[in-house]
């Protein structure tokens, strides 16, 4: 999906009002310096591309974050403010339904969410290019 035509300001507002708080809640009890950020993003479409991939793609040691509250709100924000996004996400929805069965917070998942926080912070930088 090409995130170039998203309403970035609306997504930013959604992040600031709820998604950021859900990420903090998920990370509660973890020191902010515990994990090194190894990925970043260049402009807003790039940030959303990486946020989407990191949130919804299973990785080694963290089978799924898709069932978490921040993930569901991220999906909703992208569906509302990125034209045509929902149509591209049928497979991701199936993955979310499967993932809802088990909810385990591993250290690898904490590390992944720490990376997500960094990507979202970069997305919100005032000087970051729209595209």
């Amino acid at each position: 999906y090409d995130f170039t035509n998203c309403d970035f300001e609306k997504i930013k507002a959604a992040y600031l009002s709820t998604i950021s708080k859900d990420l903090i809640t998920y990370m509660s009890g973890t020191k902010s310096t515990e994990f090194n950020n190894t990925v970043s993003c260049s402009n807003r479409p790039h940030c959303l591309t990486e946020i989407q991939s990191l949130t919804f793609n299973p990785t080694a040691g963290c089978a799924s974050l898709a069932k978490e509250m921040f993930a569901m709100k991220t999906k909703a924000a992208l569906a509302i403010w990125c034209p045509g996004y929902s149509e591209t996400q049928i497979n991701a929805t199936q993955a979310m339904k499967k993932a809802r069965k088990s909810k385990v917070t591993t250290n690898k998942c904490l590390e992944q969410v720490s990376q997500l926080q960094g990507l979202w912070r970069r997305f919100n930088r005032p000087l970051l290019k729209q595209q």
């Epitope: 090194n36 950020n37 190894t38 990925v39 970043s40 993003c41 260049s42 402009n43 479409p45 790039h46 591309t49 990486e50 991939s53 990191l54 793609n57 990785t59 080694a60 992944q112 990376q115 000087l127 970051l128 290019k129």
Partner: antibody, heavy 117, light 108 residues
Framework: QVQLQESGPGLVKPSETLSLTCTVS?????????WSWIRQPPGKGLEWIGY???????SYNPSLKSRVTISRDTSKNQFSLKLSSVTAADTAVYYC??????????WGQGTLVTVSS | EIVMTQSPATLSLSPGERATLSCRAS??????LAWYQQKPGQAPRLLIY???SRATGIPARFSGSGSGTDFTLTISSLEPEDFAVYYC??????????FGQGTKVEIK
């Protein structure tokens, strides 16, 4: 300390597919960072080809996108480049590198690929 | 595509002298700029990122400055091992990261 090593044929015929592999030691490619390919034609500057991130997202240089495929094999801690329909203009030293998806902090030593019949 | 232009193409200096290398972007890249050093037959090495932050293990004689479209890499006092080609790279314009054509710093 992370080390990267490119391998693959040094000679490819025009119109065929160039295939290279980068073997990474000292760091798991599924643990963090992105894993990138960059090339440098003889005596010229650098050109970014694309990357695959540790969580599987892939990004390509638009000028090469139609011909490029980057993939990975986490069991071997390797990632690969395929460039189809090559011409003499694709003759270059090809580097693999570790990236934070912005810049490149560790590089392989490079491998020269010549496109010639 | 953002075009990165480096000047001069070649800089002839003696060890101990100060080197000032320029990199100009065709449009603003904020501080999304890196500098690399490449010696003959070797891979590039990251020197500077975010326009002014030194990469791990890079000596303090290397410094970067600038923002927007104009950037400078300064080597305060050239050591024999600093004679090489230097490239700038912008990473503001995903998915079209571009490099400058390089500046060669040679021994006078």
């Amino acid at each position: 300390q992370v080390q990267l090593q490119e391998s693959g044929p040094g000679l490819v015929k025009p119109s065929e597919t160039l295939s290279l592999t980068c073997t990474v030691s000292g760091y798991s490619i599924s643990s963090g960072y992105g894993w990138s390919w960059i090339r440098q034609p003889p005596g010229k500057g650098l050109e970014w080809i694309g990357y695959i991130s540790y969580y599987g997202s892939i990004s390509y240089n638009p000028s090469l996108k139609s011909r490029v495929t980057i993939s990975r094999d986490t069991s071997k801690n390797q990632f690969s480049l395929k460039l189809s329909s090559v011409t003499a203009a694709d003759t270059a030293v090809y580097y693999c590198a570790r990236t934070n998806l912005l810049y490149f902090d560790s590089w392989g030593q490079g491998t020269l690929v010549t496109v010639s019949s | 595509e953002i075009v990165m232009t480096q000047s001069p193409a070649t800089l002839s200096l003696s060890p101990g002298e100060r080197a000032t290398l320029s990199c100009r972007a065709s449009q603003s890249v904020s501080n999304n700029l890196a500098w690399y050093q490449q010696k003959p037959g070797q891979a590039p090495r990251l020197l500077i990122y975010d326009a002014s932050s030194r990469a791990t293990g890079i000596p303090a004689r290397f410094s970067g400055s600038g923002s927007g479209t104009d950037f400078t890499l300064t080597i305060s006092s050239l050591e024999p091992e600093d004679f090489a080609v230097y490239y700038c790279q912008q990473y503001s314009d995903w998915p079209q990261y571009t490099f400058g054509q390089g500046t060669k710093v040679e021994i006078k």
